[in-house]
Interface confidence: low
């Protein structure tokens, strides 16, 4: 009998649901993996892939109702010719709580000594038209904003921004300002991922002189 995959787990972002597993020890070139999915409430395992040689599988298309369902469990077993292992099942229920929150993009512009930021929620192509980030997380959205100034030896963090827009009064400072954003939903336990850094340069020309 083949050994079972040691572990199976989901890594998910908004409408990007990837199942991962660790390979069995001493697998051969002909070893592949079978993937099955259980939707809570149905009581039935559905075969998704009979023979995947990769160590991950994109289950987004078959879990599109994740955000409006009771969740899923997945299982994986090794297959080598006519031999197969026991199933290894994900330890936890894959539900909305397991989705890591991300932002789509962060846009920065300069206006009269202020840096104005606009956070664009993720807009994955796979998401059904009615399932936007804002409709699924309709309340208690927050963003943590980390700002770094170059040159200058400080960073600072603006916490609890409750809107997709934010502003920074620069008090006459000039230089390059780099911003990262991490989303959260205060009523939920989802982890958030820091966005890639966006930078904007502020020079004297951006300040209006007032008497």
């Amino acid at each position: 009998e083949l050994p079972s995959p040691p572990s199976v787990w989901f890594e998910a972002e908004f409408f990007h649901h990837i199942l991962h597993w660790t390979p069995i020890p001493n697998q051969s070139e002909s070893t592949c993996y079978e993937v099955a999915l259980l939707r809570y409430g149905t009581g039935r395992w559905n075969s998704i892939s009979n023979c995947s040689q990769a160590l991950s599988y994109d289950l987004t298309a078959v879990t599109l109702d994740l955000y409006r369902s009771n969740g899923y469990r997945a299982r994986v077993r090794a297959v080598d010719g006519s031999r197969h292992s026991n199933w290894t099942v994900t330890n936890t229920r894959f539900s909305l709580d397991e989705v890591t929150l991300t932002v789509g993009s962060v846009k920065l512009e300069i206006h009269n000594g202020f840096i104005l930021g606009k956070i664009q929620p993720p807009r994955p192509k796979m998401a059904p038209a009615n399932d936007t980030y804002e409709s699924i997380f309709s309340h208690f959205r927050e963003y943590e904003i980390a700002i770094r100034k170059v040159p200058g030896n400080f960073t600072f963090t603006h916490k609890k921004v409750k809107h997709e827009n934010f502003s920074l009064l620069t008090s006459g400072e000039v230089g390059e300002f780099c911003v990262q954003v991490k989303p959260s939903v205060t009523s939920r336990t989802n982890k958030g991922m820091w966005s890639k850094e966006e930078c904007v340069s502020l020079t004297r020309q951006y300040f209006t002189v007032t008497n």
């Epitope: 100034k149 400080f154 600072f156 963090t157 603006h158 916490k159 609890k160 921004v161 920074l168 009064l169 620069t170 008090s171 400072e173």
Partner: nanobody
């Protein structure tokens, strides 16, 4: 007049933790941006952390690297600095300070923006 009194300093081993407190008296500092600076022997004052009047915004010096957290309890008129993973180079006198403004601005990274200062509490990190 706003008076500030720090406490919680002392001797701690590298890797240890301390929690500094700053109690305000004379009047409430709930409408002030408040923060912590430090001064190591033979060096100038260095910005550590600050928090705005409503607690929505925090700032940290680069050297903090996620080791410190700043918080305030307006009902107790007290400011806190929780310091974890302390290093020998964190040895300094730590000062509590209060500014008069509320707007989130880079000016609060400069000691000249702070009108009120405490007497300081000494933190020594040594084995």
């Amino acid at each position: 007049e706003l008076q500030l009194l720090e406490s919680g300093g002392g001797l701690v081993q590298p890797g240890g933790s301390l929690r500094l407190s700053c109690a305000a008296s004379g009047r409430t500092f709930s409408s002030h941006t408040v923060g912590w600076f430090r001064q190591a022997p033979g060096k100038g004052r260095e910005f550590v952390a600050a928090i705005t009047w409503n607690g929505d915004t925090t700032y940290f010096g680069d050297f903090v690297e996620g080791r410190f957290t700043i918080s305030r309890d307006s009902s107790k008129n007290t400011l806190y600095l929780q310091m974890n993973s302390l290093r020998a180079e964190d040895t300094a006198v730590y000062y509590c300070a209060a500014a008069t403004g509320q707007v989130w601005s880079l000016q609060y990274l400069r000691e000249s923006s702070y009108a009120y200062w405490g007497q300081g509490t000494l933190v020594t990190v040594s084995s």
